[in-house]
């Protein structure tokens, strides 16, 4: 079943996907699509990489992590309720039926109306049900939400996986990771 992630209307949503290149520079094509992963390719492609660059994208979708080191996590800018649904991350490993396929469920919630700033978005206050990550500006706060049921003994090293990614400072020693490859 799909792992579920949540974001509020107007925020940026983050859908994690990683792989480990077989050797430095040995990148493989990746596609992201709206809808569950089909047998081949991605349906309704929103972003695609080749062996070197992002070579197709639609507006509001981008890779903010170090995709050339395998962090192909998708950011969706300024989400609306229509962005809810299943997304497919497909690591297109050469060879017949070698692809790694990951279905991620994005749930968009109506924006909370709050009269004044609260500690609601603070990492420690919200953990473990909600992770919030700082962006690089006031408009870029992201929510990586509703983690699958995990307990503290199961928490692994997302910060290591993210390496130079913008999330690393916030997630440090805590989080959940999808490991590919």
């Amino acid at each position: 079943s799909e792992v579920e992630y949540r974001a509020e209307v107007g925020q940026n949503a983050y859908l994690p996907c990683f792989y480990t290149p077989a050797a430095p520079g040995n990148l493989v094509p990746v596609c992201w699509g709206k809808g569950a992963c089909p047998v081949f390719e991605c349906g309704n492609v929103v972003l695609r990489t080749d062996e070197r660059d992002v070579n197709y994208w639609t507006s509001r979708y981008w890779l903010n992590g170090d995709f050339r080191k395998g962090d192909v996590s998708l950011t969706i800018e300024n989400v609306t309720l229509a962005d809810s649904g299943i997304y497919c991350c497909r690591i297109q490993i050469p060879g017949i039926m070698n692809d790694e396929k990951f279905n991620l469920k994005l749930v968009i919630k109506p924006a909370k109306v709050t009269p004044a700033p609260t500690r609601q978005r603070d990492f420690t206050a919200a953990f473990p049900r909600m992770l919030t990550t700082r962006g690089h500006g006031p408009a870029e706060t992201q929510t990586l939400g509703s983690l699958p049921d995990i307990n503290l003994t199961q928490i692994s090293t997302l910060a290591n996986e993210l390496r130079d990614s913008r999330l690393a400072n916030d997630l440090r020693d805590s989080g959940a990771t999808i490991r590919i490859g």
Epitope: P24, G25, L27, D50, E51, R52, D53, V54, N55, W57, S59, W62, L63, N64, G65, D66, F67, R68, T75, E77, D164
Partner: antibody, heavy 120, light 107 residues
């Protein structure tokens, strides 16, 4: 040391084609991409495309599809770019440049440039 | 294509000045921005890649920063030999695109 030696200046007529070369030395030719960049007089840089000598794979800027053809000769470590159906808009300096994974596919070594003048 | 808007176009400087130029991408490019120096009659030279990584042999007076859509290139103390045109480049997507350049000129 790494060197990219480009062929000399070209003066051609409108409608003609021109093929320029870029001879690489000082590194393993098949381990790096070869990118090509256009610089019109006093203007910025435009990426034309790349070729990966290891497998001959190419990628082109849509703007230059049909205008430029990239090829390599692995035996002589030489990359080529042919420009077709030339017009005055194609008058520019054309650079070959090496790019590789270590620098995130930025261009760390450049040829000296080949000047192309299209004139009747 | 992603548009890289580079400012200013010209920058009058004196030796020893601290100079800063900026590049704004039309959409997020992560950290995938490079900076090049081009002197008259020469080929461009790579100075910075992946937003802030100084290329081998580049003096530490050259620094880059930024992420997402906004990037900055700084020369902490301009030397006479730094007079040149500086270009930013996004190396996130294909086609790769460059800024229009910033020309450092003597004040």
């Amino acid at each position: 040391q790494v060197q990219l030696q480009q062929s000399g200046p070209e003066r051609v007529k409108p409608g003609d084609s021109v093929k320029m070369s870029c001879k690489a030395s000082g590194y393993t030719f098949t381990d790096y991409y070869m990118d090509w960049v256009k610089q019109s007089h006093g203007k910025s840089l435009e990426w034309i495309g790349y070729i990966y000598p290891n497998n001959g794979g190419t990628s082109y800027n849509q703007k230059f599809k049909g205008k430029a053809t990239l090829t390599v000769d692995k035996s002589s470590s030489t990359a080529y770019m042919e420009l077709h159906s030339l017009t005055s808009e194609d008058s520019a300096v054309y650079y070959c440049a090496r790019s590789g994974y270590g620098n995130y596919y930025t261009m760390d070594y450049w040829g000296q440039g080949t000047s192309v003048t299209v004139s009747a | 294509s992603i548009v890289m808007t580079q400012t200013p176009k010209f920058m009058p400087v004196s030796a020893g000045d601290r100079v800063t130029m900026t590049c704004k991408a039309s959409q997020s490019v992560g950290n995938n921005v490079a900076w090049y120096q081009q002197k008259p009659g020469q080929s461009p030279k790579l100075l910075i890649y992946y937003a802030s990584n100084r290329y081998t042999g580049v003096p530490d007076r050259f620094t880059g920063s930024g992420s997402g859509t906004d990037f900055t290139f700084t020369i902490s103390s301009v030397q006479v030999e730094d007079l040149a045109v500086y270009f930013c480049q996004q190396h996130y997507s294909s086609p790769s695109t460059f800024g229009t350049g910033t020309k450092l000129e003597i004040k």
